[in-house]
């Protein structure tokens, strides 16, 4: 799986979308998990409604919400009031039994609020540094890595 980078502004909401084949994943619940390091386990943050037919209902865990458009094949995760500690690797997953298929790997990056000068030194402004080697910097909310490109396996 390539990793898609989603950039959000501190204090604001960030929406992450994970497209999938609606037929292939028909009847399956979905989940959003946080990966503890690139090779580490993925800890469940929030999952869709226990009844698959009600997957369109938004479910919250703290400041994270999940909703699933099962017909269109798009899982949407909302991170409300984004904070620096929300940065990291995540996965969108499709659940079947005790197994989980990865729909998309996501790197969440937290950018500084350009209007909040108090925290300007504590958060990253676009273009200042990169988490990925040879990554394309795009002025969109998300980008995918090139084929074969991987995140740096960074420090703990």
């Amino acid at each position: 799986h390539n990793t898609t980078v989603f950039q959000g502004v501190a204090g604001q909401s960030l929406q992450v979308s994970c497209p999938y084949d609606s037929m292939k994943h028909w009847g399956r619940r979905k989940a959003w998990c946080r990966q503890l390091g690139e090779k580490g386990p993925c800890q469940r943050v929030v999952s869709t409604h226990n009844l698959w037919l009600l997957s369109f209902l938004r479910r919250w865990n703290g400041s994270t919400a999940i909703t699933d458009d099962t017909l269109g094949g798009t899982l949407t995760i909302t991170l409300r009031n984004l904070q620096p500690h929300d940065a990291g690797l995540y996965q969108c997953q499709s659940l079947h039994g005790s197994e989980a298929d990865t729909l998309r790997k996501v790197l969440v990056e937290v950018l500084a609020d350009p209007l909040d000068h108090r925290d300007a030194g504590d958060l990253w402004f676009p273009g200042e540094s990169e988490s990925f080697e040879d990554a394309h910097v795009e002025h969109s909310i998300s980008r995918s890595l090139l084929e074969g490109e991987i995140p740096f396996p960074p420090t703990s």
Partner: antibody
């Protein structure tokens, strides 16, 4: 018991090469990144490079590029660090270090260290 | 390379003291900072990962804070076993780089 066991101390002459081994027990090295970090006497820690044993991919600090080679043998769960063209400044304790990579790894294992002395 | 600067380079403190060590990164590193403790002749030991997360088995008197370029390691009440050298390490990009270390000595 989860641990990394390194090979014994080495004494080398300037210009020679040294190869230090790091054997993992209690876990599979394919599930980790293996880093090499060195520490000269009385000095701080210096990251040398890393290998992903699963993919066979390695990456080195610019300072050591061309002089260091990090390899891994998954069949024996052992990682190796070879440093060539040794000079006296390479006298240091060399540590192997395993973690799950960037972005919040909660796993962190270190070898006991291998003293490499470079002296004529 | 990202430069990591620790301060102070050494400090003397007594058992029970509150100790604070700072680490400054030359570039933004978000929260990708770890703190290690090292005792003479031993390998480093992870204390804090992701700037503020306590590693398994580390006493709660250790805490970390910060994001971006400025980070702090705090020992709320120094214990005899805490006298050691502490290093910060950035994990935003390669090469990984360490601070020069802070030696905590007995006053």
């Amino acid at each position: 018991q989860v641990q990394l066991v390194q090979s014994g101390a080495e004494v080398k002459k300037p210009g020679a090469s040294v190869k230090v081994s790091c054997k993992a027990s209690g876990f599979s090295i394919e599930d980790f990144y293996i880093h090499w970090v060195r520490q000269a006497p009385g000095q701080g820690l210096e990251w040398m490079g890393w290998i992903d044993p699963e993919q066979g991919e390695s990456k080195y600090a610019p300072k050591f590029q061309g002089r260091v080679t990090i390899t891994a043998d998954t069949s024996t769960s052992t990682a190796y660090m070879e440093l060539s063209s040794l000079r006296s400044e390479d006298t240091a304790v060399y540590y192997c270090h395993a973690d799950h990579g960037n972005y919040g790894s909660t796993m962190d294992y270190w070898g006991q260290g291998t003293l490499v002395t470079v002296s004529s | 390379d990202i430069q990591m600067t620790q301060s102070p380079s050494s400090l003397s403190a007594s058992v029970g003291d509150r100790v604070t060590i700072t680490c400054h990164a030359s570039q933004h590193i978000n929260v990708w900072l770890s703190w290690y403790q090292q005792k003479p002749g031993k390998a480093p030991k992870l204390l804090i990962y992701k700037a503020s997360n306590l590693h398994t088995g580390v006493p709660s008197r250790f805490s970390g804070s910060g994001s971006g370029t400025d980070f702090t390691l705090t020992i709320s009440s120094l214990q005899p076993e805490d006298f050691a050298t502490y290093y910060c390490q950035q994990g935003q990009t390669y090469p990984r780089t360490f601070g020069q270390g802070t030696k905590v000595e007995i006053k």
